[in-house]
Amino acid sequence: ASCREVCCPVGPSGLRCTRAGSLDTLRGLRGAGNLTELYVENQQHLQRLEFEDLQGLGELRSLTIVKSGLRFVAPDAFRFTPRLSHLNLSSNALESLSWKTVQGLSLQDLTLSGNPLHCSCALFWLQRWEQEGLCGVHTQTLHDSGPGDQFLPLGHNTSCGVPTVKIQMPNDSVEVGDDVFLQCQVEGLALQQADWILTELEGAATVKKFGDLPSLGLILVNVTSDLNKKNVTCWAENDVGRAEVSVQVSVSFPASVHLGLAVEQHHWCIPFSVDGQPAPSLRWLFNGSVLNETSFIFTQFLESALTNETMRHGCLRLNQPTHVNNGNYTLLAANPYGQAAASVMAAFMDNPFEFNPEDPIPVSFSPVDGNSTSRDPVEKKDETPFG
């Protein structure tokens, strides 16, 4: 049976609205919840597309609004349609389209042909997309003070760029308890908004923000060592796009060190943790003397999944240690703000050459085939992978 409604279903999850002049909004489309495809045509009264219009269309993957009266698409129009991958807005009355409109979408196809698009910095992102062949952009006509059949380049004197963002930081070293003043300087045309992103700072400092474009100020009050390795970000937006810059405030504090008991892993490991800012230099002592690192005994840092902390963990790695490696291991850590040391006794194996007359004398019988090897106490058969 033919459909006489304004919008008719197409397949299990499509909707086609083509009866001329019957829609001025897309709000409240019936059965829109599981819609994946929406096709709108010949709707001269449909002039604006706002984010409320597509609310509830979370599954939408393809949107076509063609040969209609669309003049304005809100920057957040597609906030509720994150899966949108095909967008065709050809043959409407669009003069511009904000970069924010498509931000966050994984568009495979964007068609804007047949619109009186005005060549300005606000469309620089679109020009770049087309030049780079991104996601099948089709524009065909972009007007620069007059109609034309191709995407006209912006004039040579026109400088379209995202804002330039710089953060000024203190030159002096920052210590625990200090107040730190940061300033974000923004330059650029048609600046719209700017702000700080401080999500990583919770608990590391009290924050006070002040000022507005083009200069934003930030005071971090009573900083702690937890502030280290945390990003402080300033962002700014204009017609062309968004820019952001991140810095990390380095808060100095003395070296500290912790040693654990030797554990037998793939090789032997004397585990340690060191902290301090700047990162402390490390030195090992063995029985009070400097221990020079070699391929048999060396420091190996563990690659931490946490890149936002100053503490480093690692091992003094001992490859197949013998009785000569038994003794007292000390780790010295030092930075300009202090030094620390920790020691641990390690016994890897007994001295096989110490003979006690009262010990029983071991007797071993070789197998008949004679294919035997003498085994040293330290050996762990085939435990170390070759090369």
Epitope: N319, F353, R375, D376, E379
Partner: antibody, heavy 117, light 109 residues
Framework: QVQLQQSGAELMKPGASVKISCKTT????????IEWVKQRPGHGLEWLGE????????NYNENFRGKATFTADTSSNTAYVQLSSLTSEDSAVYFC??????????WGAGTTVTVSS | QAVVTQESALTTSPGETVTLTCRSS?????????ANWVQEKPDHLFTGLIG???NRPPGVPARFSGSLIGDKAALTITGAQTEDEAIYFC?????????FGGGTKLTVL
Amino acid sequence: QVQLQQSGAELMKPGASVKISCKTTGYRFSSYWIEWVKQRPGHGLEWLGEILPGRGIINYNENFRGKATFTADTSSNTAYVQLSSLTSEDSAVYFCARTDPPYFGVWGAGTTVTVSS
Amino acid sequence: QAVVTQESALTTSPGETVTLTCRSSTGAVTISNYANWVQEKPDHLFTGLIGGTNNRPPGVPARFSGSLIGDKAALTITGAQTEDEAIYFCVLWYSNHWVFGGGTKLTVL
């Protein structure tokens, strides 16, 4: 699998310097020591020294300190030895080997250096 | 610097057991010297056979074994095969450096 690929043969003038490369694949370059070994006919094998790429720790055989310089580029997983002030005594085949003590590791195929005027 | 001494040449027959030894000029070879045995075949093809006195890496045939015999390190090939004809180097660790022996040329006739 672990592989060490060395650069090609070099013909050098006395007094010049040469840099030999050892490109590694199949393991985490920064975590294992690279050994350098010299082989000369009639002189057997001589250990030049070792480097731990991830931390830049270097141990030289005292006999080659000043003659050999070890470096490593962790971005390309490549170890290098530079031999300076070359003389005929430096004509030899030079090997790199990845060591995993107590094993003396996987070896490269060697780079022949000939010093001749 | 220590000197490591090996037999210059040995000859054996297929199926026989042969033992190569390695002496240190500083005294008895101990487990702290981590004796290694490396095989060299033509065209500079080196393969590690034994590490840490008596550890055999994966892939090395079981006929190769390492041990300490008296004050020397030893490599024993039980049931030698023709493809075992090669030069065998002993390598010893002295606290912070390796020293190679002069190598033993093994002929399997």
